[in-house]
Structures are given as C-alpha cells and as structure tokens.
Interface confidence: low
C-alpha cells in the first residue's frame, strides 16, 4: 500500500468514498454547497484530501466535462504567481492576474478564472482512492 | 443586490480640487475593489484607477496618476476620488463601479457625478 | 497598453433585425472582454463577461462570441429598448480598456 504525501500519484485502488466521484486514479469531491476559498482548503484537508491541484491539460479537460458555467474553487493561488497548493507553478493554462483582490484560482467549464478569495463559491477536492492511499 | 450611490453635481473653478464619494450597500464592501470610469460629453469611457477597500491599496492608469487620489472609509462603506488641479479637461461624468467577481470588469455602477469645471 | 478598436460608430437597423458590433484588440485578450449598454444620461450596464457569458437579468436575444482579437455582439431581433450605445472592455491587462463606442439606432 502506498502513502505519505496528497499530492502524489495515486495507484489504481478500486473505490472512493461516500459521494466521491472515481476518476482515472483519483477521487474527485464537487460540493453542493459554497464556501470561502479558504474554508473550502479546511473542508479538504479534513477528509485527508486536498483542494483540486490539476496536472496537466488532460486532466483539465476531463473534470470540465463535469463542470457547469458555475464556478468552484481549486487549490491554486496567486503568490507572486500562480501556484498550485503543492507548490508547483501554473504553466498548462492561463488565468488573469492583473488585480490586488483576485488572488485565487477557480475552475469551470470554460476554463481557470482568477476571483476575491472571500467570494463563496463550491469547491472541488481531490485525493487518492481510500484515504492516505499515495504512491511514491 | 449592490447598490452605488454617487454625490451630487459640482462646479468648480480651474485650479481648486474636489472630492466625489460613492456610497455601496447591499454587499460586503471589503471583497471586491471600486473602480472609477470617467466620461467626457459625447466620448467614451476611461479608466481612472480602482482601490481595494480591505487594505486600501491603489492603482492608478498613468494618465491619472498626479490628477486622482483614491481613498476609502470602511466604516461608512464609502469610496471616494479627489481630483486635483482642475482644469475644463476635468469635466466630465465620473463613475464609481464594483468590479466583477471573475475580473476586472464592472457589473455594479453608480449613477454617475457630474464635474463642471469653469471660472 | 491594449488599444480596443469598434470599427463603427453608429449602426442602423429595423425594430426585430438583427446588430452585430464588432470590437477589436490590438492584442490577444483570450476572451476577457465585456460588453456595456449605456442609454443617454445613465450609467453603462454590464451585458456580457467572459466574451460570451450572458449577465443575469439580460434578455437572450443578446450574445456574445469571438476569440483572440476578435469579438462580437449580436442582438438578434432588436427592441425599442435597446436604442443604446454599446461599448467593449478588455481585461486582459491592466489597464482595463474600453472601446471607443458603437451607437445603434434605428433605420
């Protein structure tokens, strides 16, 4: 069995959680309710998963199959840059950084925007197929 | 729903300042920025700056950046501009706007203040 | 500084014709653009973000479209009530610009 970091790759384990959505190797979680940027990170972490770090282009397009024209927050934040919550830059997209209050990432089906991280929109977590279940 | 609402026309004379205020209700001030657009009679629109009511910051388009000074006042949920060194150039319409959730366009304006500069 | 060209300033068309407005960029604005109505002595209403995302409240017979440098808004069957100037904003920069304004009246 794997484990250690959310951010790794995850092994191919055969279900997700209660109202998880099971998506190639990972777990997906689209809330019904709206939060706060921040509150939704706390609402992640604590089901042992993290607010939605993309990967690639591929994977983008495949959750936005599931995404409507309503926002939901992902774990990506302007510091000095754009960055995903494990640290890593934005560079498979584009999203607009040319305000003092849009400092953080949403998704829909169109596409990454930047939004006032005190807006309550939904939110997307990700994380491994049973919990703590990463792949080194 | 948001609500802007501008002070009332002034006539000023060439050199002196004034300082137009923009009152929102209806939402928390401090999540998104104001943005003031200026409209001269028969043109178009001009971004002046915006400040980010939570902290204050500024930014202001270079051709305004020695003419406006944009402040805040938390308390009573008020923007305001003041332009300095007047000149019949000055007049115009301005415009407070809120700054829309996905970017910097603007999808809540006030009524518009009416600047008349003239000796 | 992006510079935003609408090619015409004045438009004529017949009540239940279709408008289309153009706007320009002078730079790829991957579709961080909006469209304002403004009717004389009012303040600019927010029609259109994201190039072709419809406000709440705005009737459908307006749409946006385009990409890159080039956009557009179609009225597609034209009321009384939208004798108006439009006018487009790119936010893909700062700053925000507008285009100079395309005032549709009727034929």
């Known amino acids: 069995l794997c484990q250690g970091s959310n951010y790794s790759t995850c092994a191919s384990c055969p279900s997700c959680p209660d109202r998880w959505m099971k998506y190639g190797n990972h777990c997906y979680y689209f809330s019904v309710e709206e939060k706060d940027w921040n509150s939704s990170l706390e609402f992640c972490l604590a089901r042992d998963s993290h607010l939605l770090v993309i990967t690639d282009n591929q994977e983008m397009s495949l959750l936005q199959v599931f995404l409507s024209e309503a926002f939901c927050w992902i774990g990506l934040r302007n510091n000095s840059g754009w960055r995903w919550e494990d640290g890593s830059p934005l560079n498979f997209s584009r999203i607009s950084s040319n305000s003092f209050v849009q400092t953080c990432g949403a998704i829909n089906k169109n596409g990454l925007q930047a939004s006032s991280c005190e807006v309550p929109l939904h939110w997307v977590c990700k994380k491994c197929p049973f919990a703590d279940q990463a792949l080194f | 729903q948001v609500h802007l609402q501008q002070s009332g026309p002034e006539l000023v004379k060439p050199g002196a300042s004034v300082k137009l205020s923009c009152k929102a209700s209806g939402d928390t001030f401090t999540t998104y920025d104001i943005t003031w657009v200026k409209q001269r009679p028969g043109q178009g629109l001009e971004w002046i700056g915006w400040?980010?009511?939570?902290?204050?910051?500024?930014q202001n388009s270079e051709k305004f950046k020695d003419k406006a000074t944009l402040t805040v006042d938390t308390s009573s949920t008020t923007a305001y501009m003041e332009l300095h060194s007047l000149t019949s150039e000055d007049s115009a319409v301005y415009f407070c706007a809120r700054r829309g959730q996905f970017g910097p366009y603007f999808d809540h304006w006030g009524q518009g203040s009416t600047l008349t500069v003239s000796s | 500084v992006i510079q935003m060209t609408q090619s015409s300033s004045f438009l004529s068309a017949s009540l239940g014709g279709r408008v289309s407005i153009t706007c320009r960029a002078s730079?790829?604005?991957?579709?961080?653009l909006a469209w304002y109505q403004q009717k004389p002595g009012n303040a600019p209403r927010l029609l259109i973000s994201?190039?072709?995302s419809l406000e709440t409240g705005i009737p459908s017979r307006f749409s946006g479209g385009g990409s890159g440098k080039d956009y557009t808004l179609t009225i597609i069957s034209l009321q009384t009530e939208d004798i108006a100037s439009y006018y487009c904003q790119q936010y893909w920069n700062t700053p925000p610009t507008f285009g100079g304004g395309t005032k549709v009246e009727i034929k």
């Open positions: 730079d790829h604005i991957y579709n961080w």
């Open positions: 400040i980010y009511p939570k902290d204050g910051r500024t």
């Open positions: 994201g190039a072709t």
